[in-house]
């Protein structure tokens, strides 16, 4: 309707997952019961409902389309299975359930993947002490995390943080085919005579359903 | 905004001594290598010293060498230089520069200059 | 001490024209460690102090117009202003920071009016 606001969408259930794994998305709070003997299911794109999933006196059918090989029902019909969860699957789902009562129940699916153990790469050959400036000490790589993960630098097992004129961390990401991350770190700094036997690493710290995680990568001098 | 403001300048007799002055604001003072560098009337530019961030490295130009002494306080986020014996020729426009590292080293921040005149 | 020789010493133009300003070095300012020349350029226009226009004998200081353009390497530079303008009436230094021990400057070229 022409001038009508926007209703805004209630706050959604929260589904996280791990790419390659089963998300379960379920059509109301866990603790809600009854008989959903008709539910349709869409996915919600670019503020359109596209319709993947239907349940009709307990029986479900698959929509054609993007996501028609990888639903099914689980358990309940209430619970909508979802199979080989990929980065592309980070969307807004909706129920509609139509019986017992008529009701709407957002689902919002979150994605993860461990980035693999990061590689590093020193950069400088010597220390050259008469430079005012700062040089790449070191480059670390992450590769197909999601989402990205947050890079840390250590400098002899401390961590190192951005410092005017003394530390630039350079930090860039591209997105891979399958949606997955692949970090790129260049830490540059200003090195010192002292720096000669200095231990420089990489940290990568991210995120699963299980909880947060980290990966180091090897040191170099 | 980054901002060097020199003072100190002025009129002084041969063999007399002044100092110079060069407050920094708008950046982190204490993490950058600092410059003082001169300019004779109506002539080129001239390094004159250059201090390390923490103070402790000083380097200055032959010439000068014994007589004048580059130093900074990074509490009060300023840079010095001590002119001692002063002769005819050291007369100029004294800047203070800023050395940014990510630059290499290059002085990509000046102040506005103090005039130091050494005449009798 | 690496000693900068930069011509010409002056130079007169009109607006609008294409100019260069060259400057030679007694010894390389391309740095191995780092793939880089050490060479700067500075604008310094009437009672101001100088203003940093080029670093790394061809990366443009934030903010300076595009028709800057810095060239070359080892020991040979150039400083090409491409459409001069009113506002580029100054004397343009070149500086070497290879040896930051002891920084050293081209004796300046003067842009003026024809």
């Known amino acids: 309707v022409p001038g009508e606001e926007k209703q805004p969408v209630p706050t959604p259930d929260l589904v996280e997952a791990e790419v390659g794994s089963t998300a379960l998305l379920k059509c109301g709070p866990s603790r809600a019961s009854g008989n959903f003997s008709q539910v349709d299911w869409f996915l919600i794109h670019k503020e359109r409902q596209i319709l993947i999933f239907r349940v009709h006196q307990g029986k479900g059918q698959r929509e054609p389309g993007e996501y028609e090989h990888r639903l099914s029902l689980q358990d309940s019909v209430a619970t909508l299975a979802l199979s080989h969860v990929t980065p592309h699957d980070e969307r807004m789902f909706l129920c509609k359930s139509k019986r017992p009562r008529l009701q709407d129940h957002y689902v919002e699916l979150q994605v993860f993947k461990a980035p693999e153990e990061p590689t590093i790469q020193a950069n400088v050959v010597g220390i050259h002490v008469d430079r005012q400036e700062l040089r790449e000490v070191a480059t670390c790589v992450g590769r197909n995390g999601y989402p990205i993960p947050q890079v840390l630098w250590y400098k002899n097992s401390l961590p190192l943080q951005e410092e005017e004129n003394r530390v630039h961390i350079q930090s860039s990401q591209i997105v891979e085919s399958s949606g997955l991350y692949t970090l790129k770190s260049v830490l540059s700094a200003r090195l010192v005579k002292e720096d000669k036997d200095a231990q420089f690493y990489c940290e990568l710290s991210y995120r699963l359903p299980s909880g947060n995680h980290m990966k180091e990568s090897k040191e170099v001098t | 905004e980054v901002r060097l403001v020199e003072s100190g300048g002025g009129l002084v007799q041969p063999g007399k001594s002044m100092k110079l002055s060069c407050v920094a604001s708008?950046?982190?003072?204490?993490?950058?290598?600092m410059s003082w560098v001169r300019q004779a009337p109506a002539k080129g530019l001239e390094w004159v010293a250059s201090i390390s961030d923490g103070g402790g490295d000083t380097f200055c130009r032959d010439l000068v060498k014994g007589r004048f002494t580059i130093s900074r306080d990074n509490a009060k986020s300023t840079l010095y230089l001590q002119m001692d014996s002063l002769r005819p020729e050291d007369t100029a426009t004294y800047y203070c520069?800023?050395?940014?590292?990510?630059?290499?080293?290059?002085?990509?921040?000046w102040g506005q200059g103090t005039s130091v005149t050494v005449s009798s | 001490d690496i000693v900068m020789t930069q011509s010409p010493s002056s130079l007169a133009v009109s607006a609008g024209e294409t100019v260069s300003i060259h400057c030679k070095s007694s010894q390389s300012l391309l740095y191995s460690g780092t793939q880089k020349n050490y060479l700067a350029w500075f604008q310094q226009k009437p009672g101001q102090s100088p203003k940093l226009l080029i670093f790394w004998a061809s990366t443009r200081q934030s903010g300076v117009p595009d028709r800057f353009i810095g060239r070359g390497s080892g020991t040979d530079f150039t400083l090409t202003i491409s459409g001069v303008q009113a506002e580029d009436l100054a004397i343009y230094y070149c500086q070497q920071y290879y040896d930051t021990l002891t920084d050293t400057f081209g004796a300046g070229t003067k842009l003026e009016l024809k």
């Open positions: 520069a800023r050395r940014g590292a990510a630059m290499g080293g290059v002085m990509d921040a």
């Open positions: 708008g950046f982190k003072f204490s993490n950058y290598y």
